[in-house]
């Protein structure tokens, strides 16, 4: 099969010539989650941006060693992040820049919900949300 | 094809001011964090200033620190570096640099022409 | 935070030139490498402690553990001869070495 039959469903939705999955992470604290691009055509590095609100635009994201890695072969990029935390929140959205053309293909985007309480203010709200 | 190009550079005397500019083509501006980078004449690279795509976080050295602003337009796709109180050791070409990748702590594989800054009398 | 690296370094055509940069605990940042000959911008060699960006030859590399990261050119050319400067990340701000300078004999 073409990747790009088997990367529209379920994997991932088709944007442009990427196809990114999963379109959606839920996680506890402190686990690790990998989102990966597949892409039609290698001729091009592929990045990461996030946006934590909907109505911005997204930003690079900040280097941990250890905690953040990208890579990529030759139809796959995979970004992976390790010990998650409240603040990794958002939707990522892998981009490839094509060396050629030097048009930019954007993901569908992936977000990543961090489950559990950051702080204790939070935990305060939740209860008074329940009662 | 990702370009910057600094301007603003010249003569000034020390104690005055002087405004650079980077114009930016060939990505979203807005989603990347920008720096300044010097290099006074005869010596080596010095990191100056980074702010954020959105403009709302800046970080300086502390060489420059309350005396230089870095700021962005991200409609005009420019960068800026207004430098006050200016001294004779701030003497250098003045670069715009991008890490152009996923993160804005990379390596800075983006960089300008540069433009010279002379602080004299 | 402080990066320091040899002023010089000569090497023959063909053999393996080595830059060192130390810093405490650098192997606990990325490393990155850039190339400056006179008149012209960095080009940056080496990100990421170890990878090379497209289009510079394979013969570069890099490490970086302890205190110590390391650029390594194997079979060096004579357009190889330029200025090096090592570069991490305290925190939120960038910090150079002074720079080395390759002379290929």
């Known amino acids: 099969a073409r990747s790009e039959d088997r990367y529209r469903n379920p994997k991932g939705s088709a944007c442009s010539r990427i196809w990114q999955s999963p379109r959606f992470i839920a996680r506890k604290r402190g686990f690790t989650v990998k989102m990966h691009c597949y892409m039609n055509s290698a001729s091009g590095n592929v990045s990461w941006l996030w946006k934590q609100e909907m109505d911005e635009n997204p930003q690079q994201l900040k280097l941990e060693k250890g905690r953040m890695e990208e890579s990529q072969n030759e139809s796959l990029a995979t970004l992976t992040i390790q010990g998650i935390r409240f603040e990794d929140n958002g939707i990522y959205f892998c981009q490839q820049k094509c060396n050629n053309t030097s048009e930019v293909y954007q993901g569908c985007g992936t977000e990543l919900r961090v489950m559990g309480f950051s702080t204790l203010a939070q935990l305060k709200q939740r209860n008074t949300l329940k009662d | 094809e990702v370009q910057l190009v600094e301007s603003g550079g010249g003569l000034v005397q020390p104690g005055g001011s002087l405004r650079l500019s980077c114009a930016a083509s060939g990505f979203t501006f807005s989603s990347y964090a920008m720096n300044w980078v010097r290099q006074a004449p005869g010596k080596g690279l010095e990191w100056v200033s980074t702010?954020?795509?959105?403009?709302?976080?800046?970080y300086y050295a502390d060489s420059v620190k309350g005396r230089f602003t870095i700021s962005r337009d991200n409609s005009k796709n420019t960068l800026y570096l207004q430098m006050n109180s200016l001294r004779a050791e701030d003497t250098a070409v003045y670069y715009c640099a991008n890490p152009s990748g996923t993160f804005w702590n990379d390596a800075f594989d983006i960089w300008g022409q540069g433009t010279m800054v002379t602080v004299s009398s | 935070y402080e990066l320091t690296q040899p002023p010089s370094v000569s090497v023959s055509p063909g053999q393996t030139a080595s830059i060192t940069c130390s810093g405490d605990?650098?192997?606990?940042?990325?490393a990155s490498w850039y190339q400056q000959k006179p008149g012209q911008s960095p080009v940056v060699v080496i990100y990421?402690?170890?990878k090379r960006p497209s289009g510079i030859p394979e013969r570069f590399s890099g490490s970086n553990s302890g205190n110590t990261a390391t650029l390594t050119i194997s079979g060096t050319q004579a357009m190889d001869e330029a200025d090096y400067y090592c570069?991490?990340?305290?925190?939120?701000?960038?910090?150079f070495g002074g720079g080395t300078k390759l002379t290929v004999l």
């Open positions: 570069q991490a990340w305290d925190s939120n701000t960038a910090v």
């Open positions: 990421q402690d170890t």
């Open positions: 702010i954020s795509g959105s403009g709302g976080s800046s």
């Open positions: 605990k650098l192997g606990d940042e990325f």
